[in-house]
Interface confidence: medium
C-alpha cells in the first residue's frame, strides 16, 4: 500500500477553502514582513501541490512531512536575508530544528499600525470586486500581527467579517452599519489573540502539566455533570489541539479541533446538557459555539468534598498510589463545585492541597496534620475576592479612563524600567477589566476578572521577554503561572529606581494630536503620565491630578485655537515649566 501522504490527508480532511486559509495563516505568522501578494503565490503553489498529492499520493515529495514541505517553501522566499536577517539562518538547519528556529523568530510585537476600517465605500467596492482576495487580506493582516492566533478561530472570525460586509455593503448608510460591527469584531479578535497567546505561553514555558491542570479546572466548571474520565479525555484532546497550533502545525490543529467537536457532539449525554444548539451548526460555528458554551447546571448529588479528600482514612494511600490522578480528581471535584472561582484560584488551591499532602503524608499522624487543610484555603480565596471588590469600587468611582490611569500610576511605580509603550498598553488592557467584569453579577466577577488579568499579564511577560529590563517582571513571569497576578499585585514601588533625566522633547506636542481618534489621544496623554512618573516616581496622587488636569486643559485649548501649531509651540513650554514646579 502506498505511503499515506500527510499533505493529501489534511487537504482531503479540511477541504480546499479551509486548507488555503490555514496555509495563508501559517505563512503569514512565520514571515510577518512579506507582502500579501508573495504569500498568495506561496499558498497557490502549496495548494496545487496538495491537490496533486490528493490525486496521487505516490507523487514526488508527497510523502514528506508537513514541516519539511512548509519549511522548504518558506526558504524559497528571495528576500529572506534582507527582510528577516537571522531568520534566514533557520534555512540551513534540518527538521525538526528548522521549524523550532522559525518559531523562535515569531515577533509578538511587529509594530504594524492597528487594523482600521478605512472609507466604507472603498472597502465595499474591494469586497464586491474580489471577495476571496478581500477576505484573504484580512486573514493575512490579522495573522501577521498576531503570530500565535488560534488559526481555526481566525477562519471563524473571517467568516464573521464576511457576514458583516455582506450585510453592510447593502445598507443605505454603510458607515453606520460597518463601524460598530467591525469594532465589535476587532475587540473579539484582540481578546481571542491574547487568550491563545496565554495558552501557548503556558505550554511553552510551563509544559503540558500546567496547561492540562488549567484545562481540567476550566472544563470541570463548564461540564460539572461529566465524570473525571470524560473531562480527562477532553483535556487530553484539547492539549493536543493547542500544542499543534502553538507549534505552527495549523493543518493538524484545525483537523483535530474538528474531530474534537465531532466527538463532543456525539457524546453530549456524558458531557453537558447545553450542547444541542451548538451541535446543530456547521463546523466553524459549531467549534466556536462549543468553546463559548454556557456552563451546565451542577448535578444534584454532589457530596461534601471533605469526605474524600480530608476525612477518608486512605487519603495518603490514594495520593501516593497515583499523585497526578489523585490531584486531578481533587481539582476536578473542587472546580465543578465552584464555578464562581477563577481558574487561577482553583489551581492555587490544588497547589496548596498538594503541598499539604506532601508534608503531612510523611508524618506519623497524617490525618491530624491535613485535617484542617480546607481552613488553609480561606486566605487564598479571600485575596482575589478583596482585590476584585476594591478595584471594582475604584472602577465605579473613576470610570474606565480614570481607572486605567490609576493602574498606570500603580504599575509605573512598581515597574519603572519597563518601556512606556508597554506600560501604557498593558495598563489600558488591565483597566478594561472593569468594563468587562465589574458589571457582571457577584458570582461571575472573580472568575471573569482574575482569568482576564492572567491573559493581560501574559502580554506583559511576552513583551518583556523580548527585551528584558526588569528583574521583578522576570521573577513574577517565570516563577509560577498561577501566581503571576498575586506576584505583581504584591509588588510595592521600586525603591532602587533612579529617576529618569528630564527631557523636554518627551513633553513636546503638536497640532496632529488634535486630529487623532479619542483612543489614540488617550494613549498620548497616558504616555505623558508615565514619562512624568519615570521622572518623578515619588509624585503624589494630588500632584499628578493637578498636572494631568492642566495637560488636558492645554490640549483642549490648543485644539480649539485658530493657530493650533502656534498654540502648542507657545503654551507647551509654559505647561512643562508649571508641571516641573508642581512636582518639585
Amino acid at each position: 500500500e502506498a505511503q499515506q501522504s500527510e499533505i493529501a490527508h489534511r487537504y482531503n480532511d479540511l477541504g480546499e477553502e479551509h486548507f488555503k486559509g490555514l496555509v495563508l495563516v501559517a505563512f503569514s505568522q512565520y514571515l510577518q514582513q512579506c507582502p500579501f501578494e508573495d504569500h498568495v503565490k506561496l499558498v497557490k503553489e502549496m495548494t496545487e501541490f496538495a491537490k496533486g498529492c490528493a490525486a496521487d499520493q505516490s507523487g514526488a515529495d508527497c510523502g514528506k512531512s508537513l514541516h519539511t514541505l512548509f519549511g522548504d517553501k518558506l526558504c524559497t522566499v528571495a528576500s529572506l536575508r534582507e527582510k528577516y536577517g537571522e531568520l534566514a539562518d533557520c534555512c540551513e538547519k534540518q527538521e525538526p530544528e528548522r521549524n523550532e528556529c522559525f518559531l523562535t523568530h515569531k515577533d509578538d510585537n511587529p509594530g504594524f499600525p492597528p487594523l482600521v476600517t478605512p472609507d466604507p465605500e472603498v472597502m465595499c467596492t474591494a469586497f464586491q470586486e474580489n471577495e476571496q482576495q478581500f477576505l484573504g487580506k484580512y486573514l493575512y493582516e490579522v495573522a501577521r500581527r498576531h503570530p500565535y492566533f488560534y488559526a481555526p478561530e481566525l477562519l471563524y472570525y473571517t467568516q464573521q467579517y464576511k457576514g458583516v460586509f455582506t450585510e453592510c455593503c447593502q445598507a443605505a448608510d454603510k458607515a453606520a452599519c460597518l463601524t460598530p460591527k467591525t469594532e465589535a469584531l476587532r475587540e473579539k479578535v484582540l481578546v481571542s489573540s491574547a487568550r491563545e497567546r496565554f495558552k501557548c505561553a503556558s505550554l511553552q514555558k510551563f509544559g503540558d502539566r500546567a496547561f492540562k491542570a488549567w484545562s481540567v479546572a476550566r472544563l470541570s466548571q463548564k461540564f460539572p455533570k461529566a465524570d473525571f474520565a470524560e473531562v480527562s479525555k477532553l483535556v487530553t484532546d484539547l492539549t493536543k489541539v493547542h500544542k499543534e497550533c502553538c507549534h505552527g502545525d495549523l493543518l493538524e490543529c484545525a483537523d483535530d479541533r474538528a474531530d474534537m467537536a465531532k466527538y463532543i457532539c456525539e457524546n453530549q449525554d456524558s458531557i453537558s446538557t447545553k450542547l444541542k444548539e451548538c451541535c446543530d451548526k456547521p463546523l466553524l460555528e459549531k467549534s466556536q459555539c462549543l468553546a463559548e458554551v454556557e456552563r451546565d447546571e451542577l448535578p444534584g448529588d454532589l457530596t461534601p468534598l471533605a469526605a474524600d479528600f480530608v476525612e477518608d482514612k486512605e487519603v495518603c494511600k490514594n495520593y501516593q498510589e497515583a499523585k497526578d490522578v489523585f490531584l486531578g480528581t481533587f481539582l476536578y471535584e473542587y472546580s465543578r463545585r465552584h464555578p464562581e472561582y477563577s481558574v487561577s484560584l482553583l489551581l492555587r488551591l490544588a497547589k496548596e492541597y498538594e503541598a499539604t499532602l506532601e508534608k503531612c503524608c510523611a508524618t506519623a499522624d497524617p490525618p491530624s496534620c491535613y485535617g484542617k487543610v480546607f481552613d488553609e484555603f480561606k486566605p487564598l480565596v479571600e485575596e482575589p475576592q478583596n482585590l476584585v471588590k476594591v478595584n471594582c469600587e475604584l472602577f465605579e468611582k473613576l470610570g474606565e479612563y480614570g481607572f486605567q490611569n490609576a493602574l498606570l500610576v500603580r504599575y509605573t511605580k512598581k515597574l519603572p524600567q519597563v518601556s512606556t509603550p508597554t506600560l501604557v498598553e498593558v495598563s489600558r488592557k488591565l483597566g478594561k477589566v472593569g468594563t468587562k467584569c465589574c458589571t457582571k453579577p457577584e458570582t461571575e466577577r472573580m472568575s471573569c476578572a482574575e482569568d482576564y488579568l492572567a491573559v493581560v499579564l501574559n502580554r506583559l511577560c511576552v513583551l518583556h521577554e523580548k527585551t528584558p529590563v526588569s528583574d521583578r517582571v522576570t521573577k513574577c513571569c517565570s516563577e509560577s503561572l498561577v501566581n503571576r497576578r498575586p506576584c505583581f499585585s504584591a509588588l510595592a514601588g521600586d525603591e532602587t529606581y533612579v529617576p529618569k533625566e528630564f527631557n523636554a522633547e518627551t513633553f513636546t506636542f503638536h497640532a496632529d494630536l488634535c486630529t487623532l481618534p479619542d483612543a489614540e489621544k488617550q494613549v498620548k496623554k497616558q504616555s505623558a503620565l508615565v514619562e512624568l512618573l519615570k521622572h518623578k516616581p515619588k509624585a503624589t496622587e494630588e500632584q499628578l491630578k493637578t498636572v494631568m488636569g492642566d495637560f488636558g486643559a492645554f490640549v483642549d485649548k490648543c485644539c480649539a485655537a485658530e493657530n493650533k501649531e502656534g498654540c502648542f509651540a507657545e503654551e507647551g513650554p509654559k505647561l512643562v515649566a508649571a508641571a516641573q514646579a508642581a512636582l518639585a
Epitope: 465524570d227 474520565a229 470524560e230 480527562s232 479525555k233 457524546n267 474524600d308 490514594n318 480528581t329 471535584e333
Partner: nanobody, 119 residues
Framework: EVQLLESGGGLVQPGGSLRLSCAAS????????MLWVRQAPGKGLEWVSV????????YYADSVKGRFTISRDNSKNTLYLQMNSLRAEDTAVYYC????????????WGQGTLVTVSS
C-alpha cells in the same frame, strides 16, 4: 444487570507476562470508562489503571507505570490488562470495574482473577 467476568490469571515467574481479559455485559460498554483494581492478600483495594470509553486517555498507578498496559475492544465489550515485567508485589486478585460518575472509586466489579508471581 451489570456483569463483569475476569479471566487470564495464573502463576507466573518474576519478570514474566500475563494478559487479563474482562468480558462485560448488562450496560453500554462503549460509553463507560473502565478500570482495573487489585487486592493483595491481607491488603485493601488498590486501583491499577483507568481507560476512557474511547480508548484514550489511560491512567496508571505509579507502581505499575511502564509495565502494565490497559486497552479495550468496544466491538467485543472486552477490557484487557497486559502485564509485563511482573514482580512478587503484583500478586493479587485483579478485578475489572465500571468507572463511576465522579471520584476515582468504582461502582461495580467482577469476581476477580488471581495472579500469583513467584519463583
Amino acid at each position: 444487570e451489570v456483569q463483569l467476568l475476569e479471566s487470564g490469571g495464573g502463576l507466573v515467574q518474576p519478570g514474566g507476562s500475563l494478559r487479563l481479559s474482562c468480558a462485560a455485559s448488562g450496560f453500554t460498554f462503549d460509553t463507560s470508562s473502565m478500570l482495573w483494581v487489585r487486592q493483595a492478600p491481607g491488603k485493601g483495594l488498590e486501583w491499577v489503571s483507568v481507560i476512557h470509553q474511547s480508548g484514550t486517555p489511560t491512567y496508571y498507578a505509579d507502581s505499575v507505570k511502564g509495565r502494565f498496559t490497559i486497552s479495550r475492544d468496544n466491538s467485543k465489550n472486552t477490557l484487557y490488562l497486559q502485564m509485563n515485567s511482573l514482580r512478587a508485589e503484583d500478586t493479587a486478585v485483579y478485578y475489572c470495574a465500571k468507572f463511576p460518575s465522579s471520584r476515582m472509586k468504582f461502582d461495580y466489579w467482577g469476581q476477580g482473577t488471581l495472579v500469583t508471581v513467584s519463583s
